[in-house]
Interface confidence: low
């Protein structure tokens, strides 16, 4: 299954399958993710050791039993591949690392005035893997607000270095944020010419191309057919790179699929996974393990499940099969891909999807009314968990915030339903940032069931909590996908890095905002927001937040949006937005429902007919 | 506005060559795969020629080896140099866009006419 | 070559008819078929593109359905506007072709 949590001062020994340096161990994770043998890993931040060659290091581990001994190592950061994680499964890291200069080879330098403009460069050329931004203050006048765009054979920097007023980053183009846009066309009977940067097995040029997307440097390909004349080189697919980004030439060659990488796609990149089976076809590979189960669908299963599995296949020799049961030779290779395909057998191969990002983890598991004041413009995939609900009588408008937390479940306020409890007059839009980006072609989702906590009263504060059941279950994207749940009755928790979002009025007194704004609110004591407002009951089911001389805030429109708190590198949902007195005003925080306290409830709700839970939180 | 403006047709004697240029505004040239489409009098569309936005170009056997598509992309402009032109390239020449998702030229040019005869 | 077959090459109808044109391709090609509509005298413009995703600012009378490879273009309650040629277009492999247009003639 999914595991989430990290280790902090441990350090797994052996096992060790690849190193790089990676700013922090968030980014060192999805290394480890998107490896195809690595299972945990193991970091080094600069002040845990001071062997300079190892700072920063990132080791990524495989090991047999899924586990590996740890060893204390003080600030050395340790935990597990998100594979199997669903939709915490992304390429996109959007932080910005301040104080550290991420090494590459430098092929580009411009002179800009922010470090966000630096990121933008990068994510909009082809060939900018990271970067690294001199500030106004940077010790060098020559070098102040110098932008370097770099690469590296293997995506990840050649050295980090600690280095004041330099600040440092990644591509944004596994955020589906890239303005360069991609070409969705595969070209029958053509061969692109360059460099060779890899070479892997595919049974189709399809797959090919999704290993060209996540390689971090293949930008085309060209794949030979299982009819190609060589037999040596059928089913190759030839990961390719080049000076300029795009092929210098291409010749037409029978028996040859060539395409473009889709990492410069914006809004939408293919999953990071094969979910297609290949009926008559055998995958070679190390042998895993091998058992017998109903149907290739199942044996699919059987090694998405075993996390270690890469591909699969299926026989139907008679010799393999006992009464409706046959083989499932469940196996794996270095590289992740089969080492051998061989064709008109009586065999069906496929792929594990343990990499899938829409698996049945609808929210993440770990074992063990009102708008926003004084806030600023979000960005694309910023916050994919928030949706906006609108009403349609005659005209349209957004009414409420709300929090995907399910496939098929949107997280809100009770109150945004006072007086409209009609399933059929909202429309729920997600995936958005611009409210004026939605036309009459624009698609949302309806609601199935409304879900008001039982003991809510519209003329109290108390119990402000409802579920939307949606009509049909939302696909994720890196626009949209759920925000991680709190565990149950969480008060152990110390959150100090917490968001309110929304499209709410920017004032007291004024209108609805175009763009979704963000606002990073201290969270308050229960007895301290008790003090400020003496005529009403805050209870332990309530979590305030705000800056004591105010200025900050939600307000009306942002209710039943959420409130969310970065912890141990993960979003958790840790309130609803409910009330205040006006808004951003002095020493009157905003209430909100605690999302912890309701957790029973919310479990209780969206169990399924079969009675499995359709999410869990973490235990 | 986003708008294309084709320029350069004419009257030209079979064996001759012309160049046609199309200046883009409004939007991003440089992002986008540009086209050319050409329509014979009373006939349907064919197409041409393209390039994509990183510079790689394609051409329908009817004119590989006698037409070549370029472009400027700091000025905005498409070209296509037409050599050894024949009279059945005879047509209205359409500069377009590829933009739609999944590649629908979703920006035309009003067309230049093209006369290739002696 | 994917090659495009549009059927009928022409037709008459009247104002506030129902009109169907088909386009077939030689091979399948999911849903990348783009419809386009062309004035005489005037350049042609993008009415749907991906089978059935109307191009913005395009009448809701016009709707593209079908998959693989058959292809319909239909428009409802025909207006005088609506008189002229339209063509299918394949994005699915290269080269892009078209089909052979259709002409929407007036009764």
């Known amino acids: 299954g999914c595991l989430t949590q990290l280790y902090e001062n441990a350090f797994f020994r052996g096992g060790d399958v690849a190193s790089m340096y990676t700013p922090n161990a968030q980014y060192c994770q999805m290394r480890c993710t998107f490896h195809p043998r690595c299972l945990l890993f193991s970091f080094l931040p600069a002040s845990s050791i001071n062997d300079m060659e190892k700072r920063f290091g990132c080791f990524l581990k495989d090991s047999v039993t899924g586990t590996l001994p740890k060893v204390h190592r003080t600030g050395a950061v340790s935990g597990h591949s998100l594979k199997q994680c669903g939709h915490q499964i992304s390429a996109c890291h959007r932080d910005i690392y301040k104080g550290v200069d991420m090494r590459g080879v430098n092929f580009n330098v411009s002179k800009v005035s922010s470090v966000e403009e630096c990121q933008k460069r990068c994510t909009s050329n082809i060939r900018c893997q990271f970067f690294s931004y001199a500030t106004q203050t940077f010790h060098k006048a020559e070098y102040r607000n110098n932008c370097l765009l770099k690469y590296s054979p293997g995506g990840t920097p050649t050295a980090i270095k600690v280095l004041s007023n330099v600040e440092s980053g990644f591509s944004l183009k596994p955020c589906a944020l890239s303005e360069i846009g991609c070409h969705m066309n595969i070209f029958q009977h053509l061969a692109f010419s360059d460099v060779d940067v890899a070479r892997v097995l595919t049974p189709d040029a399809f797959v090919c191309r999704t290993i060209c997307t996540y390689h971090p440097n293949c930008l085309f390909f060209t794949f030979y057919t299982n009819v190609w004349k060589i037999e040596s080189q059928r089913n190759v697919c030839l990961l390719k790179t080049s000076e300029s980004g795009t092929p210098s030439s291409s010749t037409p060659q029978e028996n040859t699929i060539s395409g473009y990488s889709l990492l410069t796609c914006k809004r939408t990149l293919p999953e990071p996974c094969h979910s297609k089976i290949y009926p008559g076809v055998d995958f070679g590979g190390e042998e895993l393990n091998v058992t017998f189960v109903k149907g290739v669908n199942v044996c699919q299963e059987t090694c998405t499940k075993m996390i270690r599995c890469q591909f699969f296949t299926y026989s139907l020799l008679p010799e393999d099969c006992k009464e409706e049961k046959c083989k499932c030779f469940l196996r794996l290779s270095m590289d992740g891909s089969p080492t051998r395909i061989a064709y008109g057998t009586q065999g069906s191969s496929g792929y594990s999807l343990r990499l899938c990002n829409t698996g049945d983890n609808s929210v993440c598991t770990t074992k063990t009314s009102t708008r926003i004041v004084g806030g600023t413009n979000s960005s694309w995939g910023e916050w994919p968990w928030q949706v906006s609900l609108q009403v349609k009588l005659t005209a349209q408008r957004h009414l409420c915030g709300g929090s995907l937390i399910g496939h098929q479940w949107v997280l809100t306020a009770a109150h945004c339903f006072d007086g409209l409890p009609l399933q059929d007059v909202w429309r729920i839009y997600s995936g958005i940032l611009n409210l004026s980006d939605i036309t009459k072609d624009t698609p949302f989702s309806q609601i199935k069931e409304i879900i008001i906590h039982q003991n809510y009263k519209v003329s109290e504060g108390n119990h402000d909590i409802a579920l939307i059941k949606l009509q049909a279950p939302l696909n994720y994207t890196e626009f949209q996908k759920p925000i991680c749940l709190p565990s149950k009755g969480d008060t152990s928790t110390i959150y100090t890095n917490c968001w309110v979002t929304g499209w709410g009025f920017s004032k007291e007194k004024g209108e609805i905002q175009n763009i979704l704004q963000k606002v990073n609110i201290p969270l308050v004591t229960n007895e301290e927001c008790q003090k400020r407002y003496q005529d009403y009951k805050i209870t332990q089911r309530m979590v305030c937040a705000g800056y004591k001389e105010g200025g900050k805030d939600a307000c009306k429109g942002d209710s039943g949006g959420p409130l969310v708190c970065k912890h141990n590198g993960m979003w958790r949902l840790v309130g609803i937005t409910s009330w205040g007195e006006g808004c951003a005003r002095r020493e009157q925080p905003g209430v909100y429902t605690k999302v912890a306290e309701y957790m029973d409830w919310i479990l209780e709700k969206t169990q399924s007919s079969d009675g499995k839970a359709q999410m869990q939180s973490p235990a | 506005e986003v708008q294309l403006l084709e320029s350069g047709g004419g009257l030209v004697q079979p064996g001759g060559s012309l160049r046609l240029s199309c200046a883009a505004s409004?939007?991003?040239?440089?992002?986008?795969?540009m086209g050319w489409v050409r329509q014979a009098p009373g006939k349907g569309l064919e197409w041409v020629s393209w390039?994509?936005?990183?510079?790689?170009?394609t051409y329908a056997d009817s004119v590989k080896g006698r037409f070549t598509i370029s472009r400027d992309n700091s000025k905005n402009t498409l070209y296509l140099q037409m050599n050894s032109l024949r009279a059945e390239d005879t047509a209205v020449y359409y500069c377009?866009?590829?933009?739609?998702?999944?590649?629908?030229?979703?920006?035309w040019g009003q067309g230049t006419m093209v006369t290739v005869s002696s | 070559d994917i090659q495009m077959t549009q059927s009928p090459s022409s037709l008459s109808a009247s104002v506030g008819d129902t009109v169907t044109i088909t386009c077939r391709t030689s091979?399948?090609?999911?849903?990348?078929l783009n419809w386009y509509q062309q004035r005489p005298g005037e350049a042609p413009k993008v009415l749907i593109y991906?089978?059935?995703t109307l191009e913005s600012g395009v009448p809701s009378r016009f709707s593209g359905s079908g998959s693989g490879t058959d292809f319909t273009l239909t428009i409802g309650s025909l207006q005088p506007e609506d008189f002229a040629t339209y063509y299918c277009?394949?994005?699915?492999?290269?080269?892009?072709?078209f089909g052979q247009g259709t002409k929407v003639e007036i009764t």
């Open positions: 377009a866009r590829l933009g739609g998702p999944l590649d629908a030229f979703d920006i």
């Open positions: 409004g939007f991003t040239f440089s992002w986008y795969t």
């Open positions: 390039i994509y936005f990183g510079g790689l170009t």
């Open positions: 091979q399948t090609i999911n849903n990348y």
């Open positions: 991906a089978t059935h």
């Open positions: 277009q394949q994005s699915f492999a290269f080269p892009y072709t």
